[in-house]
């Protein structure tokens, strides 16, 4: 079964600041969650206006997922615990194209970066996504922040096109991913 | 649904080898580690060591180094355990599990019970 | 390797009951822990993977806590069904290792 979210645009308009945005356009009162009150608008398809839509408002879809790029500076756990709080998960990048999508959206804040669903426990054990899954180098390589202070990067963020591993308690950006079935 | 199914019961003798088969449902074999635990009669839980279904790589505890093998095929997805130079101490309830969130066990065979005896 | 000690060792409670068990490791390993059930002649459950977040499926009356060092897997209100062997396990480094368990049975 898919879960179908309903909104209707123009009922509530939200302050400046709410959202970091590339336009001055009002959006729809996420009605979620107040964890939803920090995320970025795109050009990809969003869930505002009158519509059925396998997403919650002001989430975009590309292909079967819908992508909540967070604003709120979180540590990875604490990420992790509000994209939980949302019903999805730290995104799991499955493809070349789904890597595509994403870098295409995070480009646009240069400045930021985002943590994903990939950490470890030590450098001596291997990646894993936040499913339990393995992941794959042939997908992307991750780009090692490590240094003689800082010895364990065990968490993951993108940053622009690269991907980095990164301290898991530094504040950082994020990104939830729900996946839907048809 | 998820399933991991697994051989019958063995008996074996001192030296001898055996061999346990997990076939993995109702998800994507290659994404997931397939752990292996073993339990003696009576006992707790014994990590013995995990296979990368996608790139066959093994990671095993030092103490079974030397005489476990673990092996996949992706076209059946099912995982396998073999151990040899078996001796008394070894018999108990082997079991493969499925890798879940944190590296922890979120789903299990119905275990393999091999007993080794004279 | 890192030793898991868990206490008590078993533990007699009547449905109703809190049951707390704890679980120590012997050198830190962040949230990389895991809680598992097990009933006799069967495979352990899955209840708690990092520390402290539930399993699906799991009935919320389980909770865990801890990191580090210490954790505490809690049962709120004990049910009939919840009397068997508890084992925590750490995923922090190579091997893999479990606690030696705690008995949970009917006072």
């Known amino acids: 079964t898919m879960a179908i979210w309903r909104s209707n645009s123009g009922s509530n308009t939200l302050e400046n600041g709410y959202f970091l945005s590339r336009n001055k356009e009002n959006h729809s009162q996420p009605t979620q969650s107040s964890l939803e009150d920090s995320v970025t608008p795109t050009k990809a398809v969003k869930t505002t206006g009158v519509l059925s839509s396998p997403c919650p408002p002001n989430w975009i879809i590309y292909e079967k997922s819908c992508y909540l790029f967070s604003m709120s500076l979180n540590s990875w756990d604490g990420s992790k615990r509000q994209c939980w709080q949302l019903g999805s998960n730290l995104l799991k990048i499955d493809s070349s194209n789904e890597l595509g999508f994403i870098v295409k959206q995070v480009s646009s804040q240069p400045d930021n970066s985002f943590w994903i669903g990939l950490s470890r426990p030590q450098t001596e054990v291997p990646w894993l996504w936040e499913d339990g899954s393995t992941f794959s180098s042939n997908l992307f390589q991750i780009r090692t922040t490590a240094t003689q202070e800082n010895p364990s990067p065990n968490c993951v963020w993108i940053h622009v096109s690269v991907i980095y591993d990164q301290l898991c308690s530094v504040p950082s950006y994020s990104i939830c991913e729900k996946k839907f079935s048809m | 649904q998820v399933q991991l199914v697994q051989s019958g019961a063995e008996v074996k003798k001192p030296g001898a080898s055996v061999k346990v088969s997990c076939k993995s449902s109702?998800?994507?074999?290659?994404?997931?580690?397939i752990h292996w635990v073993r339990q003696a009669p009576g006992q707790g839980l014994e990590w013995m060591g995990w296979?990368?279904?996608?790139?066959?790589?093994?990671n095993y505890a030092q103490k079974f180094q030397g005489r476990i093998t673990m092996t996949r095929d992706t076209s059946i997805s099912t995982a396998y355990l073999e151990l040899s130079r078996l001796r008394s101490d070894d018999t108990a309830v082997f079991y493969c599990?499925?890798?879940?969130?944190?590296?922890?066990?979120?789903?299990w065979g119905q275990g393999t019970l091999v007993t080794v005896s004279s | 390797d890192i030793q898991m000690t868990q206490s008590p060792s078993s533990v007699s409670a009547s449905v109703g009951d809190r049951v707390t068990i704890t679980c120590r490791a012997s050198?830190?390993?962040?949230?990389?822990l895991a809680w598992y059930q097990q009933k006799p002649g069967k495979a352990p459950k899955l209840l708690i993977f990092?520390?402290?977040s539930l399993q699906s499926g799991v009935p919320s009356r389980f909770s865990g806590s801890g990191s580090g060092t210490d954790f505490t897997l809690t049962v709120s209100s004990l049910q009939p069904e919840d009397f068997a062997t508890y084992y925590c396990q750490q995923a922090f480094s190579f091997p893999f290792t479990f606690g030696p368990g705690t008995k949970v049975d009917i006072e």
């Open positions: 109702g998800y994507t074999f290659t994404d997931y580690y």
């Open positions: 990092g520390a402290s």
């Open positions: 599990a499925r890798n879940s969130g944190s590296y922890s066990f979120g789903y």
């Open positions: 050198q830190g390993i962040s949230s990389w």
């Open positions: 296979i990368n279904p996608n790139s066959g790589d093994t």
